[in-house]
């Protein structure tokens, strides 16, 4: 059974992931971002179901495409270089979902824009955090 300290750690990691995703969304979804329209031509694959930490596998598999899109944006829109930002997210995702679990991600038929994609995972983080508090 999860201890209160492990629950607290999970909550902190989810809050960190949430802040990173919100920072990306705010950085790109900004009228000062001259590359926004180009970034919206990229499509992302969404999870069929995202209700548990193991479903973060679906986010992990989309991190490389996410980095490619962020490379289009001017670096001043973010505090970190896209590579470092995605690397940080990857570390958190691996810790949260557990690297020993082998979960096969199932994707929805409909693809999404980067805005929809980020909003989906932001909602996921908020939802899990709310169950922990």
């Amino acid at each position: 059974a999860p201890t209160s300290s492990s629950t607290k750690k999970t909550q902190l990691q989810l809050e960190h992931l949430l802040l990173d995703l919100q920072m990306i969304l705010n950085g790109i979804n900004n009228y000062k971002n001259p590359k926004l329209t180009r970034m919206l031509t990229f499509k992302f694959y969404m999870p069929k179901k995202a209700t548990e930490l193991k479903h973060l596998q679906c986010l992990e598999e989309e991190l490389k495409p996410l980095e490619e899109v962020l490379n289009l944006a001017q670096s001043k829109n973010f505090h970190l270089r896209p590579r470092d930002l995605i690397s940080n997210i990857n570390v958190i995702v691996l810790e949260l979902k557990g690297s020993e679990t082998t979960f096969m991600c199932e994707y929805a038929d409909e693809t999404a824009t980067i805005v929809e994609f980020l909003n989906r995972w932001i909602t996921f983080c908020q939802s899990i955090i709310s169950t922990l508090t």
């Epitope: 979804n29 009228y31 000062k32 001259p34 590359k35 926004l36 329209t37 180009r38 970034m39 919206l40 031509t41 990229f42 499509k43 495409p65 490619e68 899109v69 289009l72 409909e110 693809t111 999404a112 824009t113 980067i114 805005v115 929809e116 909003n119």
Partner: antibody, heavy 126, light 108 residues
């Protein structure tokens, strides 16, 4: 309503330059980009490049790099496309088109070329 | 340079379903957009984001994408749908915009 009104037809000699204008109305000019697309007689559409009306950032098709310049004048909500060193195969109808991002709830979609100018015929002939 | 490939022509009888394809290596990760151009007129967007219909476009127009192929489908094609259709997308880096060569749809 949104309108893009282009300048009139031009006839130019090979080696000359042409500057086509595109005056926008009915929307906030600086919230969208302007793309330029051309169509040679009986041929398909060819994307030439794009300019952000917000900050003047440009992105040109590789084959036109060095010959094309796109600019905007935000005080008059007008976009310009200048093509230099004209050749006979530059004979085409030149269109300006608005492009930007649209939002439905929490989704963002790129909306390329939702409004077009009427087209400007540029004929290059000696 | 990046290319989108379309068939030069497609013919259907009125009321039949017309399918126009567009293939490009980057399409698994890039959205496709479709434009209709009638003779002597500026193009009109009929599909954006692979499958979304802009306001005012009839329901008979639909779009889909799978792998490297995007498809525009006109269910119950009408005589007024006779036009040139162009797919449009960007390359894998997102900076280079490309139109397909165009498909002439004949409804007779």
């Amino acid at each position: 309503q949104v309108q893009l009104v282009q300048s009139g037809a031009e006839v130019k000699k090979p080696g000359a330059s042409v500057k086509v204008s595109c005056k926008a109305s009915g929307y906030t000019f600086t919230s969208y980009g302007i793309s330029w697309v051309r169509q040679a007689p009986g041929q398909g559409l060819e994307w030439m490049g794009w300019i952000s009306a917000y900050n003047g950032n440009t992105n040109y098709a590789q084959k036109l790099q060095g010959r094309v310049t796109m600019t905007t004048d935000t005080s008059t909500s007008t976009a310009y496309m200048e093509l230099r060193s004209l050749r006979s195969d530059d004979t085409a109808v030149y269109y300006c088109a608005r492009e930007g991002a649209i939002y439905y709830d929490s989704s963002g979609y790129y909306f390329p070329f939702d409004y077009w100018g009427q087209g400007t015929l540029v004929t290059v002939s000696s | 340079s990046y290319e989108l490939t379309q068939p030069p022509s497609v013919s259907v009888s009125p009321g039949q379903t017309a399918r126009i394809t567009c293939s490009g290596d980057a399409l698994p990760r890039k959205f496709a957009y479709w434009y209709q151009q009638k003779s002597g007129q500026a193009p009109v967007m009929v599909i954006y984001g692979d499958s979304k219909r802009p306001p005012g476009i009839p329901e008979r127009f639909s779009g889909s994408s799978s792998g490297t192929m995007a498809t525009l489908t006109i269910t119950g094609a009408q005589v007024e749908d006779e036009a040139d259709y162009y797919c449009y997308s960007t390359d894998s880096g997102g900076d280079v915009s490309v139109f397909g060569g165009g498909t002439k749809l004949t409804v007779l």
